[in-house]
Amino acid sequence: TPLGPKWPEPVFGRLASPGFPGEYANDQERRWTLTAPPGYRLRLYFTHFDLELSHLCEYDFVKLSSGAKVLATLCGQESTDTERAPGKDTFYSLGSSLDITFRSDYSNEKPFTGFEAFYAAEDIDECQVAPGEAPTCDHHCHNHLGGFYCSCRAGYVLHRNKRTCSALCSGQVFTQRSGELSSPEYPRPYPKLSSCTYSISLEEGFSVILDFVESFDVETHPETLCPYDFLKIQTDREEHGPFCGKTLPHRIETKSNTVTITFVTDESGDHTGWKIHYTSTAQPCPYPMAPPNGHVSPVQAKYILKDSFSIFCETGYELLQGHLPLKSFTAVCQKDGSWDRPMPACSIVDCGPPDDLPSGRVEYITGPGVTTYKAVIQYSCEETFYTMKVNDGKYVCEADGFWTSSKGEKSLPVCEPVCGLSARTTGGRIYGGQKAKPGDFPWQVLILGGTTAAGALLYDNWVLTAAHAVYEQKHDASALDIRMGTLKRLSPHYTQAWSEAVFIHEGYTHDAGFDNDIALIKLNNKVVINSNITPICLPRKEAESFMRTDDIGTASGWGLTQRGFLARNLMYVDIPIVDHQKCTAAYEKPPYPRGSVTANMLCAGLESGGKDSCRGDSGGALVFLDSETERWFVGGIVSWGSMNCGEAGQYGVYTKVINYIPWIENIISDF
């Protein structure tokens, strides 16, 4: 019996009946065994076939076998109802070997030429299966020359049998208070050869409840309890199951916060599995009763572990824990059924006693001492000497706990001193220096340092003066002794003020003329305004109309009098403004350097002399009456003049204040 080629030799070739293409002899038996490599099969087809036909091919035949299975018994030339000839059919081995047997009996009625066949090895496509046959692989089948391999979808792993896909279904941990879990692929059939472990792990204090839902179908056995596939449920207290079959198991109240669900499957069966809906419960906390003027959110039928509520107060009420304010409040239910924080109160907002208003007072409008939400108070300033700046003084206790003005300001109003008030009424005539009476020059400030000088009160904590008068003290402001509210220079009865800082105009150069001879002194405390201490006004933009040539201004001070001594009593003099060109010309001749009088100066005095300010008056104010506002304002600051005060043809020279309004305002706002 000739053997065909065996792998690893090339597997292909030709087979023919003995004597082909001549007729074959009687009593012949020939057998060929063809062997292909593993993973290959043999393909065989006939190019010529002519054998004696007999019933069921009993006489002459060609038989094809693969292993124990007969693939075909062939005879004749064409197939009949009971006999088969190969025709154009191709035959395939079942495995990698194919046996071909040719036999002829003892006689032939006529000559037959036998057969010719060709064969070759070809790759088996193991992935191709006949209908109704089990698939080669569970999930994906991959054919290659000489073999195949299986692979699995995500979430599965190839079993060691190399064909089955076992589910990767362990290690899932459910931590939500409720959820669903099911067998892999549910409601499609669950995978074979799988071992699944699911954990429900909730915080201590919760108890898990398991409900089987929809359908339950796990392979079972009529006599033995779940021998094939099964579901088990384990808690720290007990084990439930195993479960299998088609009946939904009853609800399981585990009384545990941790549950392990195990599902094991074998290699056979086609069942849809199971689905569990789990919930949890815990010891409820006492129902939260909202405090008066507050409400609870969210509103629930019950509150259990980890549930929370917040308290919100009505407008005008605030959260308080005793005396302590809270912006928000949230309580959380604990495992022992108690809330983690005590209920706060919603107390009516209390803005508290309003702050005292310097130089003013406050009146309770809603009721005596009422400071709660929507209460109204009215601030007012001390009449005559103070006026309220910006707002109307009406404040309401708002929901944020602050007293708030109608303009939305939370800061106190400001009582600003009224400026330019004087007890003096001016006469039109000019006459000699006179003694001042109480209240005539309430802005007058006496400055004692190295020398005697003067100044004028601005607002309630600034003094306007000449730069040359305080230049020596610019770095030692505390050395300045500032007195006000007195007429007598040497009187012990005065209001004392001290300097916090001295601001000399940056354009002033000491001992080099008197241009920019202006300075401000900041007082370390505000002074109390009264009839004897009142600030002077700064000039308005329109003030120039009250300071034209020949308009009368008033200078006051304790400077040298005609007798050559400092005045004991405050003196004043009414003097007219002198034409600027006339004044400039008066100081053009020696001993005065050219340009002594600048545009930052104004001059006042009589051509005939005799009325003037003098040494010791320096820094004092030359004031004018604004007839529209009926307030006095500072037009000039006593600066310099002729060596001999009151000299005919010479005039007193004053710093022109209106030129310095921006400088004054900047210093005061910045400091």
Partner: antibody, heavy 114, light 107 residues
Framework: QLQLQESGPGLVKPSETLSLTCTVS?????????WNWIRQPPGKGLEWIGY???????SYNPSLKSRVTISRDTSKNQFSLKLSSVTAADTAVYYC???????WGQGTLVTVSS | DIQMTQSPSSLSASVGDRVTITCRAS??????VAWYQQKPGKAPKALIY???YRESGVPSRFSGSGSGTDFTLTISSLQPEDFATYFC?????????FGGGTKVEIK
């Protein structure tokens, strides 16, 4: 985590003003709660000075109200204490604390002496 | 002002003992009371707030009770680290006030 830290001079002269600052980290002082100053004279008990709330409102111990100012700087997450006209009786360890006292600073000793 | 009267002002006890400290308010403060532990040179540490609520991280051997005017701090089994001074505080009304303290010493 929430921390409070007091800072300021350890020595103040009589009649002057004591100034301390509490720097808060790990929590915004505008988020919630009252932010307190509390003091403890050496070997003695605790005395509440006052608080500034998350909204900026203040509450002071009436016995100190005329001398106390509590303010805050929200950009630096700090609140401050000023106690004017101090005397030797104001010598104490000064603490800042949140709410009723769930968190405290470590305290700073302020001695009033010339 | 509300006075918080603490008693005793000092006590001696052994490790494992049950210790009770009381605090009496001069007027009703609801449950707005806190208890503190203070060790030498350290800031007070909150133990209990709102009369009976334990601060997080505080051992369960510390408990508080009471409402209105009478309050109690109990240490169920005294430990070596519990020897310290204990203060009560009311935060019900302005001014917030503290008890005079109870010094717990080793017997």
């Amino acid at each position: 985590q929430l921390q409070l830290q007091e800072s300021g001079p350890g020595l103040v002269k009589p009649s002057e003003t004591l100034s301390l600052t509490c720097t808060v980290s790990g929590y915004s002082i505008t988020s919630d709660y009252a932010w307190n100053w509390i003091r403890q004279p050496p070997g003695k008990g605790l005395e509440w000075i006052g608080y500034i709330s998350y909204s900026g409102r203040t509450s002071y111990n009436p016995s100190l109200k005329s001398r106390v100012t509590i303010s805050r700087d929200t950009s630096k997450n700090q609140f401050s204490l000023k106690l004017s006209s101090v005397t030797a009786a104001d010598t104490a360890v000064y603490y800042c604390a949140r709410h009723y006292g769930d968190y405290w600073g470590q305290g700073t000793l302020v001695t009033v002496s010339s | 002002d509300i006075q918080m009267t603490q008693s005793p002002s000092s006590l001696s006890a052994s490790v494992g003992d049950r210790v009770t400290i009381t605090c009496r308010a001069s007027q009703n403060v609801g449950t707005n009371v806190a208890w503190y532990q203070q060790k030498p040179g350290k800031a007070p540490k909150a133990l209990i707030y709102s009369a009976s609520y334990r601060e997080s991280g505080v051992p369960s051997r510390f408990s508080g009770s009471g409402s209105g005017t009478d309050f109690t701090l109990t240490i169920s089994s005294l430990q070596p680290e519990d020897f310290a001074t204990y203060f009560c505080q009311q935060f019900n009304t302005n001014p917030l006030t503290f008890g005079g303290g109870t010094k717990v010493e080793i017997k």
